[in-house]
Interface confidence: low
């Protein structure tokens, strides 16, 4: 009987990577392409339809367009190899390869896709009043992850984690975690993204810098003090201008000059 074999019935691949799934079929001597039929499907989505020596791209599901191909040179070795590039989370599922060559047979192959929380963005900011540091770690991945904060002396610290959907891909999670702590320069903290799926942890190291500029969140201080200082400045400037020149036009010039010269640097320390 005509029988297909698979060397692996489970493939685990990383998001954005490539995978080649293989079904083997018996070939004696030279392959007759006109007698060969190869179908690759995934949950009713047609991926490959190879009939009469030709691949019919018209039937290919749009989600696999430009990403899935049958490796033609492998057919002559008795392998129906489906290559998927730039693997997406939606590609996970059960694939079916059906081969007809005299007889016919099919096999199922499972594809699992995971996305490690590898590219961890980090930020450190400080409250100039309380000197409390805010440490932030952010990364995208799949499945959901919890974030564990630890210090260099292995203490587990309590952070606040929020999970949203990624803008890049629907199923990808955007995990952001913050830790508020009193810390001194050169102290080291770690944020670890721990997934519930394949056991793979990803950790970022955050080192408290010597000196930090005032973070954007401290704009609130300026919003409260700003109008008062501005009003005081205007009153003083008007008084000065009127005393010196006694003309309205000079008041406008003086005040404008005073306002424009007042600049503020609101920068956060950021590391990626």
């Amino acid at each position: 009987a005509f029988t297909i074999t698979v060397s692996k019935d489970l493939y685990v691949v990383e998001y954005g990577g490539n995978v080649t799934m293989e079904c083997k079929f018996p070939v004696e001597k030279q392959l007759n392409l006109f007698a060969l039929i190869v179908y690759w499907e995934m949950e009713d989505k047609k991926i490959i339809q190879f009939v009469n020596g030709k691949e019919d791209l018209k039937v290919q599901h749009s989600s696999y367009s430009q990403r899935a191909q049958l490796l033609k040179d492998q057919l002559f070795l008795g392998k129906a190899a489906l290559q998927i590039t730039d693997v997406r989370l939606q590609d996970a599922g059960v694939y079916c390869c059906l081969i007809g060559y005299g007889g016919a047979d099919y096999k199922r192959i499972t594809l699992k896709v995971h996305a490690p929380y590898r590219n961890i963005s980090q930020r450190i900011s400080v409250d100039p009043v309380t000197s409390e540091h805010e440490l932030m770690c952010q990364a995208e991945g799949y499945p959901e992850a919890e974030v564990i904060w630890t210090s260099s002396d292995h203490r587990v610290l309590s952070g606040k984690t929020t999970i949203t959907n990624s803008n890049r891909e629907e199923k990808l999670f955007n995990v952001t975690s913050t830790l508020n702590i009193n810390a001194t320069a050169n102290e080291i903290f770690y944020c670890t993204f721990q997934r519930s799926g394949p056991e793979e942890n990803n950790t970022a190291e955050l080192v408290i810098p010597e000196r930090l500029p005032v973070p954007a969140s401290e704009r609130t201080h300026f919003m409260i003090l700003g109008p008062f200082l501005l009003l005081l400045g205007v009153v003083l400037a008007v008084t000065f201008c009127l005393k010196k020149h006694g003309r309205m036009m000079d008041v406008e010039k003086c005040c404008t000059r005073d306002r424009n010269s007042k600049k503020r640097n609101d920068i956060q320390f950021e590391e990626t």
Partner: antibody, heavy 120, light 107 residues
Framework: EVQLVESGGGLVQPGRSLKLSCAAS????????MAWVRQAPKKGLEWVAS????????YYGDSVKGRFTISRDNAKSTLYLQMNSLRSEDTATYYC?????????????WGQGTLVTVSS | NTVMTQSPTSMFISVGDRVTVNCKAS??????VDWYQQKTGQSPKLLIY???NRYTGVPDRFTGSGSGTDFTLTISNMQAEDLAVYYC?????????FGGGTKLELK
């Protein structure tokens, strides 16, 4: 025995046109992809164009796209290459090639070539 | 376009030598690479298809290997009739592109 015989080459002025032919025999012409490959004097090989067996799909190299047209007449077992707006860099021996199986690549059979010289 | 860089461009060899011709692709082309032999005054001839498959009638001293970006054609026991120019061809990306060729000459 598979045979491919090119014809139609010669001397032509820049900007003019020329049509090459390739007469095929010894196999069922309509079952195979066909291609044109060229070779400038003392230079390497350059793939020019390919055509599928039922004439629905054509593929071109960047240097000839928009100027050359590959076509076939399955009834006459003949492959053609219509070359327009010829340039001096098109000077080459043009080979007609047949795939090993019914794929666009794996050029297993080649003609003897026909020389095209583009010069004023 | 995918650039196929062949090395060396020429080689002086003796009969019986083991000869290695290399081809490097500018991007991943899988195993979609052929090797062709062209003797002086003749049309090219297909030796290897799909990176490692010897075409019908090709002597087994010719071996193709590699995948991704690096490919090799090996002639295990060089014969006088193997003196020719050897070309690699990638057909993974359109336009399909040949390497510049490697000329094998007698020492």
């Amino acid at each position: 025995e598979v045979q491919l015989v090119e014809s139609g080459g010669g001397l032509v002025q820049p900007g003019r046109s020329l049509k090459l032919s390739c007469a095929a025999s010894g196999f069922t012409f309509s079952d195979y992809y066909m291609a044109w490959v060229r070779q400038a004097p003392k230079k390497g090989l350059e793939w020019v164009a390919s055509i599928s067996y039922e004439d629905s799909s054509t593929y071109y190299g960047d240097s000839v796209k928009g100027r050359f047209t590959i076509s076939r007449d399955n009834a006459k077992s003949t492959l053609y290459l219509q070359m327009n707006s010829l340039r001096s860099e098109d000077t080459a021996t043009y080979y007609c090639a047949r795939s090993a199986w019914n794929y666009p690549y794996w050029f297993a059979y080649w003609g003897q070539g026909t020389l095209v010289t583009v010069s004023s | 376009n995918t650039v196929m860089t062949q090395s060396p461009t020429s080689m002086f060899i003796s009969v019986g030598d083991r000869v290695t011709v290399n081809c490097k692709a500018s991007q991943n082309v899988g195993t979609n690479v052929d090797w062709y032999q062209q003797k002086t005054g003749q049309s090219p001839k297909l030796l290897i298809y799909g990176a490692s498959n010897r075409y019908t009638g090709v002597p087994d001293r010719f071996t193709g290997s590699g995948s991704g970006t690096d490919f090799t054609l090996t002639i295990s026991n060089m014969q006088a009739e193997d003196l020719a120019v050897y070309y690699c061809l990638q057909y993974n990306y359109n336009p399909w592109t040949f390497g510049g060729g490697t000329k094998l000459e007698l020492k």
